[in-house]
Interface confidence: low
């Protein structure tokens, strides 16, 4: 479905899993959850983009929510695709390490 969240991309959740492809819904991009498993494709809901989770196991597809774009999790496993939802792009978790 199409989500009409913020016009930014979500940042990674503290439990979201890492992903190579991040999927997002709203106008932002979601970030990974801290406990989510790593994924190649991360899925999220809002208009943001998801980021990998710090403790989640590695996965190929991660799901997230907002309209933002996800940011990397500090301990999340590697992933190729991250999925998020809102129209924004996710940002990293509060404890996530700096992104390169």
């Amino acid at each position: 479905g199409v989500t009409s969240a913020p016009d930014t991309r979500p940042a990674p959740g503290s439990t979201a899993p890492p992903a190579h492809g991040v999927t997002s819904a709203p106008d932002t991009r979601p970030a990974p959850g801290s406990t989510a498993p790593p994924a190649h494709g991360v899925t999220s809901a809002p208009d943001t983009r998801p980021a990998p989770g710090s403790t989640a196991p590695p996965a190929h597809g991660v799901t997230s929510a907002p309209d933002t774009r996800p940011a990397p999790g500090s301990t999340a496993p590697p992933a190729h695709g991250v999925t998020s939802a809102p129209d924004t792009r996710p940002a990293p978790g509060s404890t996530a390490p700096p992104a390169h």
Epitope: G1, V2, D7, T8, R9, A11, P12, P17, P18, A19, H20, G21, V22, T23, S24, A25, P26, D27, T28, R29, P32, P38, G41, V42, T43, S44, D47, R49, A51, P52, P58, H60, G61, T63, D67, T68, R69, P70, A71, P72, G73, S74, A76, P77, P78, A79, H80, G81, V82, T83, A85, D87, T88, R89, P90, A91, P92, A96, P97, A99
Partner: antibody, heavy 128, light 112 residues
Framework: QVQLVESGGGLVKPGGSLRLSCAAS????????MSWIRQAPGKGLEWVSY????????YYADSVKGRFTISRDNAKNSLYLQMNSLRAEDTAVYYC?????????????????????WGKGTTVTVSS | DIVMTQTPLSSPVTLGQPASISCRSS???????????LSWLQQRPGQPPRLLIY???NRFSGVPDRFSGSGAGTDFTLKISRVEAEDVGVYYC?????????FGGGTKVEIK
């Protein structure tokens, strides 16, 4: 070889419909977010629509909202753009584009958010 | 929406000489994750666009080192240290920090 091949373009009258297709090969299509980006004759680039790797999340430019629908079939490695109520201003070359969000390794994730693979485009002409 | 403004519109350059293209965004492109998702694309005549630079200054695979990107916040620059004949085309900046994704109007690089 990583490749995106668009098809389905053509000449259509205002108010008409077209369905564009994009065949992906050389990479794991279901891992990537995809977008449609268009370029009117002699003009710049305009992002049209975006779809998450699973197909659950979709975004549209205001200029096409309510008229265009993006979808994908990961089993067929294909991306689609259903275009209805076409207008003269929709005339453009439509590109199928792969977006790389980044990768994670060793507990660290690195985000890119870049458009790294572009098809050659398919031309849509809306004219009476 | 974030508006991307490029200057100049056209840049006639002598072969072997440097070229510089500016891109300014209507608001900061720094994402909440600390990254700045600003890319540069090259479109040669009759071809689709091609990624050159991502996240301000990172050269994409296969891109010659004569291309470099710099900037921060709202002001960004693409530089070609020594223009070659194959560099002729239109260059676009693009932001991927926020939806809708938006592009600059393009700068045409041509040989004098």
């Amino acid at each position: 070889q990583v490749q995106l091949v668009e098809s389905g373009g053509g000449l259509v009258k205002p108010g008409g419909s077209l369905r564009l297709s994009c065949a992906a090969s050389g990479f794991t299509f279901s891992d990537y977010y995809m977008s449609w980006i268009r370029q009117a004759p002699g003009k710049g680039l305009e992002w049209v629509s975006y779809i998450s790797s699973s197909g659950t999340t979709k975004y549209y430019a205001d200029s096409v909202k309510g008229r265009f629908t993006i979808s994908r079939d990961n089993a067929k490695n294909s991306l689609y753009l259903q275009m209805n109520s076409l207008r003269a201003e929709d005339t453009a070359v439509y590109y199928c584009v792969r977006e790389n969000l980044g990768y994670c390794t060793g507990g660290n994730c690195f985000y890119y958010y870049y458009m790294d693979v572009w098809g050659k485009g398919t031309t849509v002409t809306v004219s009476s | 929406d974030i508006v991307m403004t490029q200057t100049p519109l056209s840049s006639p350059v002598t072969l072997g000489q440097p070229a510089s293209i500016s891109c300014r965004s209507s608001q900061s492109l720094v994402h909440s994750d600390g990254n700045t998702y600003l890319s540069w694309l090259q479109q040669r005549p009759g071809q689709p666009p091609r990624l050159l630079i991502y996240k301000i200054s990172n050269r994409f695979s296969g891109v010659p080192d004569r291309f470099s990107g710099s900037g921060a916040g709202t002001d960004f620059t693409l530089k070609i240290s020594r223009v070659e004949a194959e560099d002729v085309g239109v260059y676009y900046c693009m932001q991927a920090t926020q939806f809708p994704l938006t592009f600059g109007g393009g700068t045409k690089v041509e040989i004098k």
